[in-house]
Interface confidence: low
């Protein structure tokens, strides 16, 4: 079951999947001047049995100037102006979650690839947050949302996360020590598409995030 | 369908303390973030206290740091703003929400007037 | 503190009309934008959230856009029962503040 709307939107925060439940949906995004082969796959698919989890089918993309009829069902990075997103940068690895059971691997870039990636996720999708670059989190404790199943309607909890600036810290009162968190994604609580990026988040990164509390939907 | 109910206000001389009360119901309480928002007569809203789903984390606006606690009891589904010192600008209806930032849902308010 | 400055203070309109408050925020606000309406002797309701997407169970009516420091809530076809007070609310920053309010009668 394909989850309705987006992960919640916390102000100066990213989150990052990592690792995809089956079922999950890349779509296949080409960089302008660029689109899908004719007979190319519009996404990926995360497919597998009970021991291993692969990503079906594989993105290709093909010069524009290359005459090519393929009609685009999904809209081109340049269409997606309203959606937030992050530049992609060099995927990485989890050692910790990447080989559960039922789950892919961020899957590797394919050539001329959009610089965003677009994910459908499933029911039971974990993403974790952690503030973007300039800002920190107050207070230890988990920040993950997952996509739920509730009276037939799927709905994301909400994280315990708020990331303040440098600045503004001394308006916080007893927080703790926080280290400091990178990269960033923006907003979206409507839409059924997701864009996400693959910023660099350490494996110890649960152990590290801090938290705090304001959430922005009913869970 | 969400019921946020408060209690505890009243008329109150200044210097004194008092306590409100949100008794929630009809949504999983002790998952979600709450918060007190006051609005003083004819005068625009504001956020007073906020309070992290589990209670480890509280938050205050400056002008009522050290004199008001946020506290909640998960088991009683039930939000609390403990008022001390009590100042004539403290006037106000106080609404219990939820949702954190949000306000998405809200109480119907209650009335504290600090008055000697 | 960021700042919301609410405009007009005062709103009077026909049914029918078309209506927009327009907020102002101190500093970009990057879209963290609420807007609430109360009637009067009652607790404010949401009515958008994030700049732009209604809450579930707002009329269609109301819409809101907006970006940096800028935002607006617009009534398409004003109707009787939106005699209202109308605020708008950031949360990008702690602590979240929310505009002076704007009052809206018919006319």
């Known amino acids: 079951e394909l989850c309705d709307d987006d992960p919640p939107e916390i102000p100066h925060a990213t989150f990052k999947a990592m690792a995809y439940k089956e079922g999950t949906m890349l779509n296949c995004e080409c960089k302008r001047g660029f689109r899908r082969i004719k007979s190319g796959s519009l996404y990926m698919l995360c497919t597998g049995n009970s021991s291993h989890s692969s990503w079906d089918n594989q993105c290709q993309c093909t010069s524009s100037a290359t005459r090519n009829t393929t009609k685009q069902v999904t809209p081109q990075p340049e269409e997606q102006k309203e959606r937030k997103t992050t530049e992609m940068q060099s995927p990485m690895q989890p050692v910790d979650q990447a080989s559960l059971p039922g789950h892919c691997r961020e899957p590797p870039p394919w050539e001329n690839e959009a610089t965003e990636r677009i994910y459908h996720f499933v029911v039971g999708q974990m993403v974790y947050y952690q503030c973007v670059q300039g800002y920190r989190a107050l207070h230890r404790g988990p920040a993950e949302s997952v996509c739920k199943m509730t009276h037939g309607k799927t709905r994301w909890t909400q994280p315990q996360l708020i990331c303040t600036g440098e600045m503004e810290t001394s308006q916080f009162p007893g927080e703790e020590k926080p280290q400091a968190s990178p990269e960033g994604r923006p907003e979206s609580e409507t839409s059924c598409l997701v864009t996400t990026t693959d910023f660099q988040i350490q494996t110890e990164m649960a152990a590290t995030m801090e938290t705090s509390i304001f959430t922005t939907e009913y869970q | 369908e969400v019921q946020l109910v408060e209690s505890g206000g009243g008329l109150v001389q200044p210097g004194r303390s008092m306590k409100l009360s949100c008794a929630a119901s009809?949504?999983?309480?002790?998952?979600?973030?709450m918060a007190w928002v006051r609005q003083a007569p004819k005068k625009g809203l504001e956020w007073v206290a906020y309070?992290?789903?589990?209670?480890?984390?509280?938050y205050y606006r400056d002008s009522v740091k050290g004199r008001f606690t946020i506290s909640r009891d998960n088991a009683k589904s039930t939000l609390y703003l403990q008022i001390d010192s009590l100042r004539s600008e403290d006037t106000a209806t106080y609404y219990c929400?939820?949702?954190?930032?949000?306000?998405?849902?809200w109480g119907q308010g209650v009335m504290v007037t600090v008055s000697s | 503190d960021i700042q919301m400055t609410q405009s007009p203070s005062f709103l009077s309109a026909s049914v029918g009309d078309r209506v927009t408050i327009n907020c102002k925020a101190s500093?970009?606000?990057?879209?963290?934008v609420n807007w609430y309406q109360q009637k009067l002797g009652e607790a404010p309701r949401r009515l958008i959230y994030?700049?732009?997407s209604l809450q579930t169970g707002i009329p269609s009516r109301f819409s809101g856009s907006g970006s940096g420091t800028d935002y607006t809530l617009t009534i398409s076809s004003l109707q009787p029962e939106d005699v209202a007070t109308y605020f708008c609310?950031?949360?990008?920053?702690?602590?979240?503040?929310f505009g002076g309010g704007t009052k809206l009668e018919l006319k």
């Open positions: 929400t939820t949702g954190g930032n949000s306000g998405y849902d």
């Open positions: 009809g949504f999983t309480f002790s998952n979600h973030a």
């Open positions: 309070i992290s789903y589990d209670g480890d984390n509280t």
């Open positions: 500093q970009n606000v990057n879209k963290f």
């Open positions: 994030g700049t732009n």
């Open positions: 609310q950031q949360y990008s920053s702690w602590p979240w503040t």
